[in-house]
């Protein structure tokens, strides 16, 4: 029950996180005009990963896409790449995790297969979250650098008479959405990995008890396994993580410690 809850919660948290990463990637407000000393502006500039926008007092908003690929800063390209990789990994992770959910029955899929899929999706979510956090952080660092550079030469005088006000940009809403979403995806991934441990049958060694009866030795394995005959190096005396379907008896009699996580 605890495993199912952990897995389900991990899935939901990751789903929200990935939705947030997609939203952040599509948002136009990655950087917004810094309204230093001037909270009211007639022309407000903001920029995203794909286009830059200008909103006027008139209510008119104009957005222009970055129609060049080679002319864009390498850092921006890197951020785009990180966010897209994050989305792709997250989407694949979601797809895998749907089939891995304990509460969903798909044919005769064994618990070990579900455990593997849960682990895979968990790792994918973790990497996806890290990609998003990295992407947003790289962009934020770029903003901070540019902010202080433009502050240093805020006003570039022309003959000491005319002033050209340089537009400074600060953190936009998309950065915070990205950080939170990346964090949620990461947390969801960790939860999936924890759930995986609970889904996997334990690899516990059980020593066979030998009985010498009528010149015929029988080794008995506990937990509803069939007895194997003969002595010697009987490797089948182990509870092997063979993706094996555990019987109802086994589940009841020998609950895994991970079921109580």
């Amino acid at each position: 029950m605890a495993v199912t809850a952990c897995q389900g919660l991990g899935f939901v948290v990751s789903l929200i996180g990935i939705a947030g990463i997609i939203a952040a990637t599509c948002m136009d407000q990655w950087s917004t005009q810094d309204l230093y000393n001037n909270p009211v502006t007639a022309v407000f500039n903001y920029q995203g990963l794909w286009r830059s926008c200008v909103r006027e007092s008139s209510g008119f908003t104009e957005c222009r896409g970055y129609f060049t690929l080679l002319g864009l800063p390498a850092m921006l390209q890197a951020v785009r790449a990180l966010m897209i990789v994050g989305i792709v990994l997250g989407a694949i992770g979601l797809l895998v995790s749907i089939f891995a959910l304990k509460c969903i029955r798909i044919g005769s899929m064994e618990d070990s297969a579900k455990a593997n899929m849960t682990l895979t999706s968990g790792i994918m979510f973790i990497v996806s979250g890290l990609c998003a956090i990295a992407g947003v952080s790289v962009f934020a660092n770029m903003l901070v650098t540019n902010f202080w550079m433009s502050t240093a030469n805020m006003y570039t005088g022309m003959g000491g008479m005319v002033q050209t006000v340089q537009t400074r940009y600060t953190f936009g809403a998309a950065l915070f959405v990205g950080w939170v979403a990346g964090g949620l995806t990461l947390i969801g991934g960790v939860m999936m990995c924890i759930a995986c441990r609970g889904l996997a049958p334990e690899e516990t060694n059980y020593k066979a008890v030998s009985y010498h009866a009528s010149g015929h030795s029988v080794a008995y394995k506990p937990g509803g396994f069939k007895a194997s005959t003969g002595f010697g190096s009987n490797t089948k005396n182990k509870k092997i993580y063979d993706g094996g379907a555990r019987t109802e008896d086994e589940v009841q009699s020998y609950p895994s410690k991970h079921d109580y996580v």
């Epitope: 502006t41 007639a42 022309v43 500039n45 200008v54 006027e56 007092s57 008139s58 222009r64 005319v162």
Partner: antibody, heavy 118, light 113 residues
């Protein structure tokens, strides 16, 4: 089409107050900034301030803070400007105008002449 | 505040002549975000409210004759009337629409001989 109809001219005594109205029609009144502009006889234009009727947000020219108070009534699609402590310097034609692309003022009222005289 | 300086303060021309008037701003009116200049030109005839001619420094308002052309960028702007007509007798104002408070130039009075 967009129309801005202003109240009639007024003669007021120094120290008194006057309230000018500007009734808008032909557009969504709440969605656009309404601007007020002053023009003294034979002089240039001065931006007094603006009001966003949707939420009552205002933005004033520092020169007119304390002099002009902008309000708006959404139900009647009317903007108001109250001028207080009037002096001869306040004798002017006051225009209401609606903001347009490029923050330009495309639609203008006919103007209200305020004369301050003892 | 951005100071707008217009020149000349008045000019007298003959109908059919080409006219140019200048407007200079104390700060650049060019917005880096959309590469647009937030400068507007108005025409005010006696006893009338101003009429919008040109916004974004060079975009002609609908209904404005194409003899009116706005040009310039940054801090230097020009309004050109390619062939002055009698009905163009008016005062022409430029305005900063880039930052608050919005400021107007003192105007250029156009008179016809």
């Amino acid at each position: 089409q967009v129309q801005l109809q202003q109240s009639g001219a007024g003669l007021v005594k120094p120290g008194a107050s006057v309230k000018i109205s500007c009734k808008a029609s032909g557009y969504a009144f709440s969605s656009y900034w309404m601007i007020w502009v002053k023009q003294r006889p034979g002089k240039g234009l001065e931006w007094i301030g603006q009001i966003y009727p949707g939420d009552g947000d205002t933005n004033y020219n520092g020169k007119f803070k304390g002099k002009a108070t902008l309000t708006a009534d959404k139900s009647s699609s009317t903007a108001f400007m109250q001028l207080s402590s009037l002096t001869s310097e306040d004798s002017a034609v006051y225009f209401c105008t609606r903001i347009y692309y490029g923050n330009a003022f495309a639609y203008w009222g006919q103007g209200t002449l305020v004369t301050v005289s003892a | 505040d951005i100071v707008m300086t217009q020149s000349p303060s008045s000019l007298t021309v003959t109908a059919g002549e080409k006219v140019t008037m200048s407007c200079k701003s104390s700060q650049s009116l060019l917005n880096s975000g959309n590469q647009k200049n937030y400068l507007t030109w108005y025409q005010q005839k006696p006893g009338q409210p101003p009429k919008l001619l040109i916004y974004w420094a060079s975009t002609r308002e609908s209904g404005v004759p194409d003899r009116f052309t706005g040009s310039g960028s940054g801090t230097d702007f020009t309004l050109t009337i390619s062939s002055v007509q009698a009905e163009d007798l008016a005062v022409y104002y430029c305005q900063n629409d880039y930052s608050y408070p919005f400021t107007f130039g003192s105007g250029t009075k156009l008179e016809i001989k």
